[in-house]
């Protein structure tokens, strides 16, 4: 496997592009069991209807790979565990990509992104100790291809869930 992006290995802030700029996805640093900071993106606007919060990564080179794999580690709160929000709370998010030769795209319209999948929390999860708390970490892998341009952007769309993206890894498999 060749890693193209690993959010856990980025030094400092990830600095991905959130839309809207305020009120949606927020970059939040948490400490793992070794007291090392983990950069996460979190959103939990579960009280207000019609959420449409987007988060876009930096440009990712495909290094000639025809097909890439996206591994997302995330937590997703069960709406039943959040009091009184059953009408507005959701339990999925959407994953998109946009191919581009331009590594400095300023504005990408929502309708330019291609949907990869709707992601939901699985019944299986890994328990991770974070200080005095246990985090239930879901892992989902999706693949995209065939790719033709020099690189691509990933986007995550929140529609009203309580979610934290803990790690995003993009890789391809060597022939």
């Amino acid at each position: 496997e060749v890693t193209l992006l690993d959010s856990r290995s980025v030094q400092g802030e990830l600095g991905w592009i959130a839309s809207p700029l305020e009120g949606g996805w927020e970059e939040v640093s948490i400490m793992d069991e070794k007291n090392t900071p983990i950069r996460t993106y979190q959103v939990c606007n579960v009280m207000e209807p019609s959420q449409n919060n987007w988060l876009r990564t930096d440009w990712i080179t495909r290094e000639g790979a025809q097909r890439v794999y996206i591994e997302i580690k995330f937590t997703l709160r069960d709406c039943n565990s959040l009091p009184g929000v059953m009408g507005t709370c959701k339990e999925t998010f959407n994953l998109y990509y946009y191919e581009s030769d331009n590594d400095k795209e300023r504005f990408i319209r929502e309708n330019q992104f291609v949907k990869i999948d709707t992601i939901a929390a699985d019944e299986s999860f890994t328990q991770v100790d974070i200080g005095d708390r246990i985090m239930k970490l879901n892992t989902e892998i999706r693949d995209v291809g065939p790719l033709s341009k020099k690189g691509f952007y990933l986007a995550f769309q929140d529609v009203g869930a309580c979610i934290a993206l803990v790690s995003v890894r993009v890789f391809y498999k060597k022939a």
């Epitope: 979190q42 709160r77 985090m135």
Partner: nanobody, 118 residues
């Protein structure tokens, strides 16, 4: 041990105002958001307002435009300014943290009673 202490409730006439306060001790304010909840007799507890570390606020429909949530991380305090109160706002009000990462509701404070008379 986490301790949450709500205060500022009372009896007020419809159309009046109250400011609730919540003091948190025994935990750092490193959660994604702090929130206010309420529970009226015979009803389920409901979340009505939240404020993230970055200052983003969101509100449940019944209180939108009348209630304002704020936080002071230096003092480990969360506030709820309630204006134009209605009899249906009568409830016990609680504060707590919310996080996408884990269930924060291991501990609840005693709450503070708000009664709005018509």
């Amino acid at each position: 041990q986490v301790q949450l202490q709500e205060s500022g409730g009372g009896l007020v006439q419809a159309g009046g105002s109250l400011r609730l306060s919540c003091a948190a001790s025994g935990r750092t304010f490193n959660s994604y958001a702090e929130a206010w909840f309420r529970q009226a007799p015979g009803k389920e507890r409901e979340m009505i307002a939240a404020v993230t570390k970055a200052g983003t606020t969101n509100y449940a429909n019944p209180v939108k435009g009348r209630f304002t949530i704020s936080r002071d991380d230096a003092k480990n305090m969360v506030y709820l300014q309630m204006n134009n109160l209605k009899p249906e706002d009568s409830a016990v009000y609680y504060c707590n943290a919310i996080s996408p990462l884990w269930d924060e509701y291991d501990f609840w404070g005693p709450g503070t009673q708000v009664t709005v008379s018509s």
